[in-house]
Amino acid sequence: TQDTFRGSVLEGVLPGTSVMQVTATDEDDAIYTYNGVVAYSIHSQEPKDPHDLMFTIHRSTGTISVISSGLDREKVPEYTLTIQATDMDGDGSTTTAVAVVEILDANDNAPMFDPQKYEAHVPENAVGHEVQRLTVTDLDAPNSPAWRATYLIMGGDDGDHFTITTHPESNQGILTTRKGLDFEAKNQHTLYVEVTNEAPFVLKLPTSTATIVVHVEDVNEAPVF
């Protein structure tokens, strides 16, 4: 016997989307009498967010479907439904089971820079020097493609002096020098970095941009003939 069932559904789906099916068996006759005819109902839902009727169950098949809009993994990632199965087509003996519905993540949250402005100091001529770590927050599921950040230098790097990579654990953007900077040629660079996710957004979301002012520090260089 099974008294706990699991199912899953993507956040943001439309009402009517099927989630899972639960089944209860009854050895009594279901052809000539109603003794073995099972009727299903949802007794309770936890949590009751955004309200207490997010799901419905088909009375005779036990198929659970979404009945309301508003499934949001970032607010409620999992629901627990108490299901009742009653024989005699709903007028007889009742047994209960639990259905756990996991709300799957969609990339419906953009990563956001926090902070959005940085100042850094870099000695001239240093190659592979870590300039700055950029921090983002993302409400999607941690360590998923919808959470992992992808950074792009959008402007300010005319000489292709900089590169940015994503730290695999912290999700920070690590800005480093690709080639040496020349204090005498340009002592300040203002970079504009945009962040998106590995996974595409499921809806149109504004992208976050950070500004990094990089001050190049003079290094005493030997005279050249």
Epitope: Q2, R6, P47, K75, V76, V98, W147
Partner: antibody, heavy 118, light 113 residues
């Protein structure tokens, strides 16, 4: 490295409310489930309930009528209140982080002993 | 609730020998949609919180020595320590997370013979 630390009174009188707070450091409280457990001396582990960073809760049905959990994301803390306590509620109480949205617990507090006695 | 039953309650094994702990669930914890068993194993030493060893029945948590392994599916699971070390003395718990009402086995106390 994520660290959790339970705090609260070690002694509670019968019929009163047990209140504990778990402070999370080294990581954000956002996008995770946070659970409370208890373990009477020499006994096994009992799950009390969990709260998501949004404030959404699930409680152990056997304790549901007495349990309230809350979260304060600005302080990176979550809390447990257990009302109408008796001597049977004497235990070491642990807070823990759920791994993803599963009921796997990868980070735990060191635990705090709460004794219910007059 | 899903009831978890461990056997034996206590176990004494010689250093370097194999230790085997069994866990049985009152219903299947295998989710057919992702073919994963929602079962974990924890180690708890005196005065310490539990430590996650194994999840999805057989996946070792990062940093856990490879002498620890998990196996099984459906309702029957096993934790094996291939060569017992002194630091492995502890109580071991299985836990199901198939249901939101998380439940643990009663624990198996592992000692050195």
């Amino acid at each position: 490295q994520v660290q959790l630390q339970e705090s609260g009174p070690g002694l509670v009188k019968p019929s009163e409310t047990l209140s504990l707070t778990c402070t999370v450091s080294g990581g954000s409280i956002s996008s995770y489930y946070w659970s409370w457990f208890r373990q009477p001396a020499g006994k096994g582990l009992e799950w009390i309930g969990r709260i998501y960073s949004s404030g959404s809760t699930n409680y152990n049905p056997s304790l549901k009528s007495r349990v309230t959990m809350s979260v304060d994301t600005s302080k990176n803390q979550f809390s447990l209140k257990l009302s109408s306590v008796t001597a049977a509620d004497t235990a070491v109480y642990y807070c823990a982080r759920g791994m993803g949205v599963t009921g796997l617990f990868d980070y735990w507090g060191q635990g705090t002993l709460v004794t219910v006695s007059s | 609730d899903i009831v978890m039953t461990q056997s034996p309650d206590s176990l004494a094994v010689s250093l370097g020998e194999r230790a085997t702990i069994n866990c049985k669930s009152s219903q299947s914890v295998l989710y057919s949609s992702n073919n994963k068993n929602y079962l974990a194993w924890y180690q708890q030493k005196p005065g310490q919180p539990p430590k996650l060893l194994i999840y999805w029945a057989s996946t070792r948590e990062s940093g856990v020595p490879d002498r620890f392994s998990g196996s099984g599916s459906g309702t029957d699971f096993t934790l094996t320590i291939s060569s017992l070390q002194a630091e492995d003395v502890a109580v071991y718990y299985c836990q199901q997370y198939y249901s939101t009402m998380y439940t643990f086995g009663q624990g198996t106390k592992l000692e050195i013979k």
